[in-house]
C-alpha cells in the first residue's frame, strides 16, 4: 500500500499501526496516502524535525505508551489536516511552544499520562478549533491565566489526577462551549467563587478525591445545564444553604466521603431531573423533615455509613419515585411509624447494621411494592404480627444475626417465617438468643414449647399466611439483590474517575448495586 | 381516632418534683415520638424533649436537660413527664403532644396546669 | 437555638378583613415551619406545615407561604371563630422554637 514500513501493519482503509519495542524511530517511508497512524508500545524516545513530512493527508495520529520524553519543535509540521493528536502515556516533561503550530484542524489533543510539570498559555495559543484537551494525569501543580483563553470552541478539558492545589477564577472564563471539565484527583483545597461563572454551556463537573473543604455559596449558580456533579472524597463538612439551588437539569450527584454533619432543609433543589444521590461515608446525625423534598425524581438515596441516630417522620417527603433507600450502617434506635409513608414506589430498603430495638407495625404499611429488606444485624427481639402481610412483592427478607427472643411470642412470627422461607435465603438463618437452653437454634424450627416449657403457650394467632409462589422471581444467593460482591461507589461514566472496589463482607454490605457504600 | 389525656392540675413548692402523665389511645403507642411542650403564662410555646415509647429513648431541650426525664409505661399507653427543683418560673400549662406526618404537632394532650407557689 | 420572630404580637380586626401575620426565623430552616391556633384554656391546634400545607379540617381561607427564614401566615376573609392567639413553629433543628405569637384581636 504504497510502501508499508516492515514494521508496521497497513490496511487498505489507510490506516497504519507501527508497534513493538523494537521500534526505535519513526519507521519511514509512511504510505503517502495515510489518514491515521498509530505508533504504539515502542521504544521511541523522541521525535525529531518533520518526521511526518510526507503524509499531509493524515487526520489521526495517535503516539501513545512509548518512551517519548523529547519532541523536536516542528515535529507535527505539515499535519494541516490532523483532527486527532494523542500522545498519551508517555514520558513527557516539557512541551515545546510552537509544537502544535499549523494544527489548525486539530479537534482532539490528548497529553494524558505523562510527565508534564506545568502549561502557558502559548501552547495552545494557536489551537483554536480544539473541542478535547486530556491533561489528566501528569505532574502539574498550577494552571497559568490565560493558558486556555483562546480555546473557545472545547467542550471537553481533563485535568484529573495532576498536582493542583489551587485555581484561578479566571483559567476557565473563555470556555463557554466547555460541557465537560474533570479536575479529579489534584489537591485542591478550595475553589474560589466566579470560578466556573462562564461555564454556562457545562454538563460534567468532577470534583471528587480533592481536598476541598468549602464550597462557595453561589460556586455553581451559572450552570444551569449542569448534568452530572461529582463531589465525592473531598473534606466538606457543611453546604451552604444556596448552593446547589440553580441546578435544575442534574442528575446525577455524589457526596459520599465527606465530612457532612447536616443536610439543612431546602440543601437539595430544586432539582427535578435529579435520579441518585450518594451520601454514604459522612458523618451525617440526623435527618430533619423534608430535607430531600424538592427530590420528586430521585430513585436511589444512599445513606449508609453515616452517624443517623434520629429520622424525623418527614425526612423522605417528596420522595413518590424512590426505589432504593440505603440506611445501613448507621445508629438508628427508633424509627416513627410515619417514616417510610411517602415511598411509596421503594422496592429495596436497607437497615442492617444498625440498633434497631423494635419495628413499629405499620412501618412498611404504604410501601407495598418492597422486593427487598435488609434487617440483619441490628437488636431485634421480635415483630409486630402482620408487619409483612401486605408485601406480595417481597422476594428477599434478611433477618439473621439479631437477637430472637424464642418465647410464645415469637409463634406468629415463626409461623410466617416458615411459610415464607425461600425468601429469607439458604446462607444465614436468623437463630433465637433467648431464652438460653435454645440459644443458636433455628427460630424458624424450633419448638416453642420446648423453649419456654415453664410457660402457658396460649393460641397465638399466627401471621396471616402469605405463601411463597413458585413463579415468583426467586434470588438465589448468587444472583442475589444484595449480593455480597458489590460496586462500593456509584460508576461514573468514564473509567478514569472511580476505581471500582469489591467485597466479600456480608456483615458491611448486603445491599443492591446501587444501594452499596 | 388518636386522643391524649393528661393528668390533673398540680400545685407545688419550689425545690419540689412534678410528674404529669400522658395517657395514650387510637393508635399504637410505642410506634409514635411523643413530645412534651410547655406554656407559661404570657410566654411562648417551649418544646422540652421527646421519648419513644418503643424504646424509651430520650432527647431533651438542653435548658431543661438534668431538670427533666421523660419516661413511659407501654402496657399502660402512658407517657410521664418529670421536672425536678422547681421554681416559680415553671408555672406553665405541660402539654404531651404527638407528630403527625413529620415533625410538627398534629395531636395535643389538654394540658396540665403546674402551679409553683410557696 | 433557632430564633423565630413574630410579628405583629398583636392586632386588631373585623370579620372580612385580610390579615397577615409573618414570622423570621434566624437561620434558614427550609419549608420546616408550622402555624398554630390557640384559643383561650385550650391546646394549640395545628393550621399549616411544611409551610404551606393545610391541615385536615383547617378552612380554605387559612394559607401559608415562604421558604427559608421568612414565612407568612394569611387569613383571606377572617371569620369571628379566628380570634385566637398564631403560633409559628420551626422543626428544622433541635430545640424546636415557636414564635412569640400574635393576638388576633376584634376591632
Known amino acids: 500500500y504504497h510502501g508499508c514500513p516492515s514494521e508496521c501493519t497497513c490496511s487498505r482503509a489507510s490506516q497504519v499501526e507501527c508497534t513493538g519495542a523494537r521500534i526505535v524511530a519513526v519507521p519511514t517511508p509512511l504510505p503517502w496516502n495515510a489518514m491515521s497512524l498509530q505508533i504504539l508500545n515502542t521504544h521511541i524516545t523522541e521525535l525529531n524535525e518533520s518526521p511526518f513530512l510526507n503524509i499531509s493527508a493524515l487526520i489521526a495520529l495517535r503516539i501513545e505508551k512509548n518512551e517519548l520524553s523529547r519532541i523536536t519543535p516542528g515535529a507535527f509540521r505539515n499535519l494541516g489536516s490532523l483532527r486527532y493528536l494523542s500522545l498519551a502515556n508517555n514520558k513527557l516533561q516539557v512541551l515545546p511552544i510552537g509544537l502544535f503550530q499549523g494544527l489548525d484542524s486539530l479537534e482532539s489533543l490528548l497529553l494524558s499520562s505523562n510527565q508534564l510539570l506545568q502549561i502557558q498559555p502559548a501552547h495552545f495559543s494557536q489551537c483554536s478549533n480544539l473541542k478535547e484537551l486530556q491533561l489528566h494525569g501528569n505532574h502539574l501543580e498550577y494552571i497559568p491565566d490565560g493558558a486556555f483563553d483562546h480555546l473557545v470552541g472545547l467542550t471537553k478539558l481533563n485535568l484529573g489526577k495532576n498536582s493542583l492545589t489551587h485555581i484561578s477564577p479566571r483559567v476557565f472564563q473563555h470556555l463557554g462551549n466547555l460541557q465537560v471539565l474533570r479536575l479529579y484527583e489534584n489537591r485542591l483545597t478550595d475553589i474560589p467563587m466566579g470560578t466556573f461563572d462562564g461555564l454556562v454551556n457545562l454538563q460534567e463537573l468532577a470534583l471528587q478525591q480533592n481536598q476541598i473543604g468549602l464550597l462557595s455559596p453561589g460556586l455553581f449558580h451559572n450552570n444551569h445545564n449542569l448534568q452530572r456533579l461529582y463531589l465525592s472524597n473531598n473534606h466538606i463538612s457543611q453546604l451552604p444553604p444556596s448552593v446547589f439551588m440553580q441546578l435544575p437539569q442534574l442528575n446525577r450527584l455524589t457526596l459520599f466521603g465527606n465530612s457532612l454533619k447536616e443536610l439543612s432543609p431546602g440543601i437539595f433543589g430544586p432539582m427535578p431531573n435529579l435520579r441518585e444521590l450518594w451520601l454514604y461515608d459522612n458523618h451525617i446525625s440526623s435527618l430533619p423533615d423534608n430535607v430531600f423534598s424538592n427530590l420528586r425524581q430521585l430513585q436511589v438515596l444512599i445513606l449508609s455509613r453515616n452517624q443517623i441516630s434520629f429520622i424525623s417522620p418527614g425526612a423522605f417527603n417528596g420522595l413518590t419515585e424512590l426505589r432504593e433507600l440505603s440506611l445501613h450502617t448507621n445508629a438508628l434506635q427508633d424509627l416513627d411509624g410515619n417514616v417510610f409513608r411517602m415511598l411509596a414506589n421503594l422496592q429495596n430498603i436497607s437497615l442492617q447494621n444498625n440498633r434497631l430495638r423494635q419495628l413499629p407495625g405499620n412501618i412498611f404499611a404504604n410501601v407495598n411494592g418492597l422486593m427487598a429488606i435488609q434487617l440483619q444485624n441490628n437488636q431485634l427481639e421480635n415483630l409486630p404480627l402482620g408487619i409483612f402481610d401486605h408485601l406480595g412483592k417481597l422476594c428477599e427478607l434478611r433477618l439473621y444475626d439479631n437477637p430472637w427472643r424464642c418465647d410464645s411470642d415469637i409463634l406468629p412470627l415463626r409461623n410466617w417465617l416458615l411459610l415464607n422461607q425461600p425468601r429469607l435465603g439458604t446462607d444465614t438463618v436468623p437463630v433465637c438468643f433467648s431464652p438460653a437452653n435454645v440459644r443458636g437454634q433455628s427460630l424458624i424450627i424450633i419448638n416453642v414449647n420446648v423453649a419456654v416449657p415453664s410457660v402457658h403457650v396460649p393460641e397465638v394467632p399466627s401471621y396471616p399466611e402469605t405463601p411463597w409462589y413458585p413463579d415468583t422471581p426467586s434470588y438465589p444467593d448468587t444472583t442475589s439483590v444484595s449480593s455480597t460482591t458489590e460496586l462500593t461507589s456509584p460508576v461514573e461514566d468514564y473509567t478514569d474517575l472511580t476505581t471500582i472496589q469489591v467485597t466479600d463482607d456480608r456483615s458491611v454490605w448486603g445491599m443492591t448495586q446501587a444501594q452499596s457504600g | 381516632q388518636v386522643q391524649l389525656v393528661q393528668s390533673g392540675a398540680e400545685v407545688k413548692k419550689p425545690g419540689a418534683s412534678v410528674k404529669v402523665s400522658c395517657k395514650a389511645s387510637g393508635y399504637t403507642f410505642t410506634d409514635y415520638y411523643i413530645n412534651w411542650v410547655r406554656q407559661a403564662p404570657g410566654q411562648r410555646l417551649e418544646w422540652m424533649g421527646w421519648?419513644?415509647?418503643?424504646?424509651?429513648?430520650?432527647k431533651y431541650n438542653e435548658k431543661f436537660k438534668g431538670r427533666v426525664t421523660i419516661t413511659r409505661d407501654t402496657s399502660a399507653s402512658t407517657a410521664y413527664m418529670e421536672l425536678s427543683s422547681l421554681r416559680s418560673e415553671d408555672t406553665a400549662v405541660y402539654y404531651c403532644?404527638?407528630?403527625?406526618?413529620?415533625?410538627?404537632?398534629?395531636?395535643w394532650g389538654q394540658g396540665t396546669l403546674v402551679t409553683v407557689s410557696s | 437555638d433557632i430564633q423565630m420572630t413574630q410579628s405583629p404580637s398583636s392586632l386588631s380586626a373585623s370579620v372580612g378583613d385580610r390579615v397577615t401575620i409573618t414570622c423570621k426565623a434566624s437561620q434558614n430552616v427550609g419549608i420546616n415551619v408550622a402555624w398554630y391556633q390557640q384559643k383561650p384554656g385550650k391546646a394549640p391546634k395545628l393550621l399549616i406545615y411544611s409551610a404551606s400545607y393545610r391541615s385536615s379540617g383547617v378552612p380554605s381561607r387559612f394559607s401559608g407561604s415562604g421558604s427559608g427564614t421568612d414565612f407568612t401566615l394569611t387569613i383571606s376573609s377572617l371569620q369571628p371563630e379566628d380570634f385566637a392567639t398564631y403560633y409559628c413553629?420551626?422543626?428544622?433543628?433541635?430545640?424546636?422554637?415557636f414564635g412569640g405569637g400574635t393576638k388576633v384581636e376584634i376591632k
Open positions: 403532644a404527638r407528630w403527625g406526618y413529620g415533625a410538627y404537632f398534629t395531636y
Open positions: 413553629q420551626q422543626y428544622s433543628s433541635f430545640p424546636y422554637t
Open positions: 421519648i419513644y415509647p418503643g424504646s424509651g429513648n430520650t
